[in-house]
Interface confidence: low
């Protein structure tokens, strides 16, 4: 009679992560009589997944009654796969022997590729705000999917972008692995409402990619630009002032008044209008009481935006005598000297 | 379509100035920064520095600093290089181009490019 | 400031040829290089960004390859109107530099 072989007709099986795998195997003939068992890898430190003789393995079943007298079909089914559950499995055929079984025949092995899926990329911009034109990087993480096979593009509002660098680990085999991108992406000004989409596409994802994404009004910073005039007089000896603070972001804004370089007032923007870009305008005005001035007044609007340097924007006040002031006594310029001389509001628009 | 075009050639007596400009067609000049390449006779190509044409902040390399100035008039869409007190050794043409991005430690590549100004010096 | 070494500075082939132009960079500038040609009175014309990204209309014959310190500009089968001066530039770090340039000139 043949001498018995053991067949394992798979040389891989491939199953999704939580799904069940079948691993078949046959012998050709009953003898010798001994115990099958089924081990994961080769050599010294193989791993015991199943003994037929002994032992308690609650995720393995197998196909067939291992009881029969006649059973040659040695299958079995391991449940609730995980990526672990990677590598090469053997059915062993054991001889009866004293006082332990000795090992007869290996099948030659089949491989189990998990299929995991990656998980949900997270996007991740950088720590400190920046400014248009500036070059800003994202990274983009996806953990615990196999096989290692996977692509990865990088969006900004729907246009894919080229400038990215990828990488997979581990570089050699593994039950399970990471991608890691980095993207360059050039902020412009219309940035506010912006986002970078990072997306993943594996086979166990079945065409539908995964998206992780981040909004580019958490990276940019837009400086405001700062207009100052004079509008025309409101009353007799008073002219307002304004000062018009545009296209900035984030909203955290604090402008001073400054009269000949001493500050007169303080204020943060508050009820701001919003452009269309995501970028706001504020302003804010004081009246002057020109009377109250011998010489030109220099004012200037100060904005501190986000925690930034202070930027300024300067307008020098021509004071000219009125003629109803002219003659007047020295006595009466001081006293107009003393007196409060800028009257501060601010109005929103 | 992109482009980017320079002002003619110069010859200028040392000690003279000028002024190249780089007019932006085809896209907003405030949204990419400007660079200013110096490629005198025969040699290759230097990087004298950039304009953040947003802000308008210029950034000059090494040898580039003191006599040269880098400027905008966004109104027409146009950068300026600015030479002072030129000298016989300031002889090269004038490039202009665009930078992909304005990086912070990183630089830029350039994407588009004017045609070139030659400058002479010579008395 | 970083140099930027070509090599060969100049290379004679023949249209149909596979030429090889390597730019070593005196430290890591990782793929923030960029190559471009220049014809004799011409501006230099942008071929590769990144070290590996062609820019729109160049062709294909064209690539990039290398990180770190190592670049390599290859052009598949040359053309009549390849024979220029190529000049490697990284961008990492300030100031940019360019290599010294390669001439490549008809055999």
């Known amino acids: 009679e043949e001498e018995l072989q053991v067949i394992q007709p798979d040389k891989s099986v491939l199953v999704a992560a939580g799904e069940t795998a079948t691993l078949r195997c046959t012998a050709t003939s009953l003898i010798p009589v001994g115990p099958i068992q089924w081990f994961r890898g080769a050599g010294p430190g193989r791993e015991l997944i199943y003994n037929q003789k002994e032992g308690h393995f609650p995720r393995v079943t197998t196909v067939s009654d291992l009881t029969k007298r006649n059973n040659m079909d040695f299958s079995i089914r391991i449940g609730n796969i995980t990526p672990a559950d990677a590598g090469t499995y053997y059915c062993v055929k054991f001889r009866k022997g004293s006082p332990d079984d000795v090992e007869f025949k290996s099948g030659a092995g089949t491989e189990l590729s998990v299929r995991a899926k990656p998980s949900a990329p997270v996007v991740s911009g950088p720590a400190a705000r920046a400014t248009p034109q500036h070059t800003v990087s994202f990274t983009c993480e996806s953990h615990g999917f196999s096989p290692r096979d996977i692509t990865l593009k990088w969006f900004k509002n729907g246009n894919e972008l080229s400038d990215f660098q990828t990488n997979v680990d581990p570089v050699g085999e593994s039950v399970s692995y990471s991608i890691h991108s980095t993207a360059k992406v050039v902020l412009t000004r219309e940035d506010v409402h912006s986002q970078v989409i990072c997306e993943v596409a594996h086979v166990t994802l079945q065409g539908d990619p995964l998206r992780g994404t981040a909004n580019l009004s958490e990276t940019i910073r837009v400086p405001p630009t700062l207009e100052v005039t004079q509008q025309p007089v409101r009353a007799e000896n008073q002219v307002n002032v304004t000062c018009q603070v545009r296209k900035f972001y984030p909203q955290r804004l604090q402008l001073t008044w400054l009269e000949n370089g001493n500050v007169s007032r303080t204020e943060t923007a508050s009820t701001v209008t919003e452009n269309k870009d995501g970028t706001y305008n504020w302003m804010s005005w004081l009246l002057v009481n020109v009377s109250a001035h011998r010489d030109d007044v220099k004012l200037t609007c100060q904005v501190e935006h986000d925690g930034q340097p202070a930027v300024s924007k300067s307008h020098d006040l021509k004071v000219s005598a009125h003629p109803k002031e002219q003659g007047s006594n020295t006595a009466a310029e001081n006293t107009g000297s003393n007196e409060r001389n800028i009257y501060h509001h601010h109005h929103h628009h | 379509q992109i482009q980017l075009v320079q002002s003619g050639s110069e010859l200028k007596k040392p000690g003279a100035s000028v002024k190249v400009s780089c007019r932006a067609g085809?896209?907003?000049?405030?949204?990419?920064?400007m660079n200013w390449v110096r490629q005198a006779p025969g040699q290759g190509l230097e990087w004298m520095g950039f304009i953040n044409t947003y802000t308008g902040e210029p950034t000059y390399a090494q040898g580039f600093k003191g006599r040269f100035v880098f400027s905008l008039d966004t109104s027409v869409s146009t950068a300026y290089l600015q030479i002072g007190s030129l000298k016989a050794e300031d002889t090269a043409v004038y490039y202009c181009a665009r930078t992909r991005g304005y990086y912070d430690f990183d630089g830029g590549a350039f994407d588009y490019w004017g045609q070139g100004t030659l400058v002479t010096v010579s008395s | 400031d970083i140099q930027m070494t070509q090599s060969p500075s100049s290379l004679s082939a023949s249209v149909g040829d596979r030429v090889t132009i390597t730019c070593r960079a005196s430290q890591n500038v990782g793929t923030h290089l960029a190559w471009y040609q220049q014809k004799p009175g011409k501006a230099p014309k942008s071929l590769i960004y990144s070290a590996i990204y062609r820019y729109i209309g160049v062709p294909s014959r064209f690539s990039g390859s290398g990180s770190g310190t190592d670049f390599t500009l290859t052009i598949s089968s040359l053309q009549p109107e390849d024979f220029a001066t190529y000049y490697c530039?990284?961008?990492?770090?300030?100031?940019?530099?360019f290599g010294q340039g390669t001439k490549l000139e008809i055999k």
């Open positions: 530039q990284q961008y990492n770090t300030y100031p940019l530099t």
């Open positions: 085809g896209y907003t000049l405030t949204d990419y920064a």
